[in-house]
């Protein structure tokens, strides 16, 4: 069975969208009007993964670049990163795992947790134009839900 | 948690079309990635996947079968159904609905059993 | 058609013995393929996927191999509750199952 991908955008619960910010990084801040075209489309595939009650296991890739988040160890710390992946062979019913999302849909709100490191969510600052990042911790500061928009192919 | 249930007719006779329900609770199948199928499995015999709906409602078919078959879901009341059109014998087995993201078929119905005789 | 075939029908073993059952695939599913186990009057319940991935909850006895057209499912220190019917299932394209091996005591 062929990987199954959908194209979308996401806004944390604070509705501030996600843009690149150099080569290797996203950071959220709000957008109006014409800038919305500066945020991020995101083709999210589903995967092979650990099912369970409401997770859905995804890989997160920038739509037409080689480029998908993944977390890794970087001083002993869970962190997310962009990475460059060859075309030809990604996406993949298996992914590494390091590329593996949990998928959490509650109400229309996500979660993003790492397979790589569980209980470790993809974040936003409370702040604006602030890197999103790998987060330890649900339900304090740091926002871990976001809601998706499909965009059509 | 995940619970699924399969409801259908018990008897029915050759040539009708049966009609099998499955109820689930624990997800939504609204959710994106989500997909559940129809798997059959004959008295003492081994498994035959049947139909798959994703949450999108793209359907997949068993190819020997796809015409006889029909696959819907009403998201908004947690259920799925299939339609197999013109029954014999050969149908008569219990039948499964099973919850899939991807084709590994982790959490499944009780299964109901369903007899075709004249 | 992607066919599996499971050559043993049934296979005896012992309690606390360690048991080999094997699926063949009519053509390269590469690691796409799934274990379960199925009790009399039960549904089946995922034991293995990706060829050797254990699914949450399956106790370590049980482990998956393969690759490509042959994959093994064995069961380690079996104990009286693995007594039950195993397929082995591909989903490399649309999903099919081996015929089942029924685990015995000897």
């Known amino acids: 069975a062929p990987v199954r991908s959908l194209n979308c955008t996401l806004r944390d619960s604070q509705q501030k969208s996600l843009v690149m910010s150099g080569p290797y990084e996203l950071k959220a801040l709000h957008l109006q009007g014409q800038d919305m075209e500066q945020q991020v489309v995101f083709s999210m595939s589903f995967v092979q993964g650990e099912e369970s009650n409401d997770k859905i296991p995804v890989a997160l890739g920038l739509k037409e670049k080689n480029l998908y988040l993944s977390c890794v160890l970087k001083d002993d710390k869970p962190t997310l990163q962009l990475e460059s992946v060859d075309p030809k062979n990604y996406p993949k019913k298996k992914m590494e795992k390091r590329f593996v999302f949990n998928k959490i849909e509650i109400n229309n709100k996500l979660e993003f947790e790492s397979a790589q490191f569980p209980n470790w969510y993809i974040s936003t600052s409370q702040a604006e134009n602030m890197p999103v990042f790998l987060g330890g911790t649900k339900g304090g500061q740091d926002i871990t839900d976001f809601t998706m928009q499909f965009v059509s192919s | 948690q995940v619970t699924l249930k399969e409801s259908g007719p018990g008897i029915l006779q050759p040539s009708q079309t049966l009609s099998l329900t499955c109820s689930f609770s624990?997800?939504?199948?609204?959710?994106?990635?989500?997909?559940v199928s129809w798997i059959r499995q004959p008295s003492g015999k081994g498994l035959e996947w049947l139909a798959h709906?994703?949450?999108?409602?793209?359907?997949r078919y068993n190819p020997s079968l796809k015409s006889r078959l029909t696959i819907s879901k009403d998201t908004s009341s947690n259920q799925v159904f299939l339609k197999i059109t013109s029954v014999d014998t050969a149908d008569s087995a219990t039948y499964y609905c099973?919850?899939?993201?991807?084709?590994?078929?982790?959490?499944w119905g009780q299964g109901t059993l369903v007899s075709v005789s004249a | 058609d992607i066919v599996m075939t499971q050559s043993h029908k049934f296979m005896s073993t012992s309690v606390g013995g360690r048991v080999r059952i094997t699926c063949k695939a009519s053509q390269d599913v590469d690691t796409d393929v799934a274990w379960f186990q199925q009790k009399p009057g039960q549904s089946p319940k995922l034991l293995i996927y990706w060829a050797s991935t254990r699914h949450t909850g399956v106790p370590d006895r049980f482990t998956g191999s393969g690759s490509g057209t042959d994959f093994t499912l064995t069961i380690s220190n079996v104990q009286s509750e693995d007594l039950a019917d195993y397929f082995c299932?591909?989903?490399?394209?649309?999903?099919?199952f081996g015929a089942g091996t029924k685990l015995e005591l000897k």
């Open positions: 299932q591909q989903y490399s394209s649309y999903p099919t």
């Open positions: 624990g997800f939504s199948l609204s959710t994106s990635g989500m997909g």
């Open positions: 099973a919850r899939s993201a991807y084709y590994s078929f982790a959490y």
């Open positions: 709906i994703y949450w999108d409602d793209d359907k």
